[in-house]
């Protein structure tokens, strides 16, 4: 329970203004009314409160809104947002992109990735899906934030907005997120010509299945090694040496540099050594000549 102190008459607060910066923590607790604070939230960010004072103001809002803040308060949080935990944010219902922009600006330069991820999640839930306006806001104010969304949330992305996503927006996306985004991108770019298609689809290839990689290998795409290294391990392993050579084109030489790193290392272990030797790169670790490869996983699947 909170230790209660009475507000001295001369310290009574009738409006939220600059005079409050001179109040001690106990005085703020006793004298600032949470309902008044909520009604005048638009004034708070202009007042240079200390972090300790902001703590008190946060506790006041928590007192007033135990089930989470309404958007009328959230949009005016300003630097008070820095005091919020992901658990606090999870209680919010946010639909306004102006609110999202304001809070993304505040969070810049602070270690708040968990809070920002939760905020974006709440916006997507509040708006029903990750629509084009939300995606545009994220790419403009928080590059990389798209990848903070769960695969479940990303599944609501309509293919029509994929075109607005830039390569750098996907830099921090994990395999499960790319698994969701890749089919949408494939659909979005399906009417493009070969080279144009590859440029567009490249950032999403971390979610591509083996069949699509095989198809790409027939199109002289010359995939760069950075993109290859982001491909799903399971998608790369079934590719033959010839297919990888066609896929990478002149970049195939980079395999030597990456031969100790996944997925290259794992792929090498699956190839016949004499096939690897045809590349002339000195890649070692393939299956020795004369060895028979039994794929037990296939037998298990059949039995």
């Amino acid at each position: 329970d909170v230790e209660r102190t009475t507000c001295p008459p001369e310290k009574e607060v009738h409006e939220i203004d600059e005079s409050l910066i001179f109040y001690k923590k106990r005085e703020l607790e006793a004298c600032v009314d949470a309902a008044l604070l909520a009604a005048q939230m638009d004034r708070v960010d202009a007042i240079p409160f200390t972090y300790e004072q902001l703590d008190v103001l946060k506790h006041k809002l928590d007192e007033l809104y135990p089930q989470g803040y309404p958007e009328s308060v959230i949009r005016h949080l300003g630097h008070l947002f820095l005091k919020m935990s992901p658990e606090d944010i999870r209680k919010w219902n946010v639909t306004s992109l102006e609110t999202l922009k304001a809070l993304l600006k505040v969070s810049k330069g602070h270690e708040m990735s968990a809070q920002v991820a939760t905020l974006i999640d709440r916006v997507v839930v509040g708006r029903g899906q990750l629509d084009k306006d939300t995606a545009d806001t994220l790419t403009a104010f928080c590059p990389g934030c798209l990848c903070s969304l769960s695969p479940e949330r990303l599944s609501s992305v309509p293919p029509s907005i994929i075109g607005a996503v830039r390569p750098q927006d996907l830099d921090t996306c994990g395999p499960r997120q790319l698994d969701v985004l890749y089919p949408k991108a494939r659909l979005a770019f399906q009417n493009m010509s070969g080279s144009e298609y590859f440029v567009k689809i490249r950032p999403f290839l971390g979610g591509a299945p083996t069949e699509d990689l095989k198809a790409l290998s027939q199109q002289n795409v010359s995939m760069d090694l950075a993109t290859f290294m982001k491909l799903r391990r399971e998608a790369v392993l079934p590719l033959s040496v010839a297919e990888v050579q066609k896929l990478l084109g002149p970049h195939v030489e980079g395999l030597k540099v990456e031969e100790q790193h996944s997925p290259v290392r794992d792929w090498i272990l699956k190839q016949r050594q004499d096939d690897l030797d045809t590349l002339g790169l000195g890649l070692q670790g393939g299956i020795p000549n004369g060895y028979l490869i039994l794929d037990l996983s296939v037998r298990e699947a059949l039995s």
């Epitope: 607790e29 949470a34 309902a35 909520a38 009604a39 005048q40 007033l64 809104y65 135990p66």
Partner: antibody
Framework: EVQLLESGGGLVQPGGSLRLSCAAS????????MSWVRQAPGKGLEWVSN????????NYADSVKGRFTISRDNNKNTLYLQMNSLRAEDTAVYYC????????????WGQGTLVTVSS | EIVLTQSPGTLSLSPGERATLSCRAS???????LAWYQQKPGQAPRLLIY???SRATGIPDRFSGSGSGTDFTLTISRLEPEDFAVYYC?????????FGQGTKVEIK
């Protein structure tokens, strides 16, 4: 079901004291702002006071400041209004009301208790 | 303090007619913090409208609220016999949380 039940009203002489109570049920009292509103006979509503749930921050109308004290007992789910130095103009029906912070309005009211200040 | 002035003081209308009640504030009030209440003789007030325009639970859609800044309106589109009562506006924008003096809607 939300219920607010006021008690403690009655006849008191000018200068006297009275303590009103409001028993609350059907909601989480410990999370809720509570208010007192009064209505003089044949007149309109007048906001009297309110109190916050955790810090027990209080606010008063100028007409009662220094004479009335609002308080609460979160363990008993009860709101109080201690009225001292009563005047004839304090004669009114006193309502206890729940403040809904999400609506910024008084969404539930008690039936009221009549306080008569007369000699 | 914010003074809320309601007009007219009394509105004499017949059932089925439209009622328009006004609430004017002496200084700007955020629409999120303006509410309307209905009170019938011998009863406690009842919340009708909060946030200037949102109907409280169980309130029929013939009641609507509008306005911003200093001018707010409560409209009853078609008066029913049970709507004849006194109506109050209230602001929670700053302390004290003042009420208007009320508008009585009576049967003509």
């Amino acid at each position: 079901e939300v219920q607010l039940l006021e008690s403690g009203g009655g006849l008191v002489q000018p200068g006297g004291s009275l303590r009103l109570s409001c028993a609350a049920s059907g909601f989480t009292f410990t999370h809720t702002y509570m208010s007192w509103v009064r209505q003089a006979p044949g007149k309109g509503l007048e906001w009297v006071s309110n109190i916050s749930p955790t810090y027990s921050t209080t606010n008063y109308a100028d007409s009662v400041k220094g004479r009335f004290t609002i308080s609460r007992d979160n363990n008993k789910n009860t709101l109080y209004l201690q009225m001292n130095s009563l005047r004839a103009e304090d004669t009114a029906v006193y309502y206890c009301a729940r403040y809904n912070a999400y609506h910024a309005a008084l969404d539930y009211w008690g039936q009221g208790t009549l306080v008569t200040v007369s000699s | 303090e914010i003074v809320l002035t309601q007009s007219p003081g009394t509105l004499s209308l017949s059932p089925g007619e439209r009622a328009t009640l006004s609430c004017r504030a002496s200084q700007s009030v955020s629409s999120s913090y303006l509410a309307w209440y209905q009170q019938k003789p011998g009863q406690a007030p009842r919340l009708l409208i909060y946030g200037a325009s949102s109907r409280a639970t169980g309130i029929p859609d013939r009641f609507s609220g509008s306005g911003s800044g200093t001018d707010f309106t409560l409209t009853i589109s078609r008066l029913e016999p049970e709507d004849f009562a006194v109506y109050y506006c209230q602001q929670h924008n700053q302390y004290p949380n003042t009420f208007g003096q009320g508008t009585k809607v009576e049967i003509k």
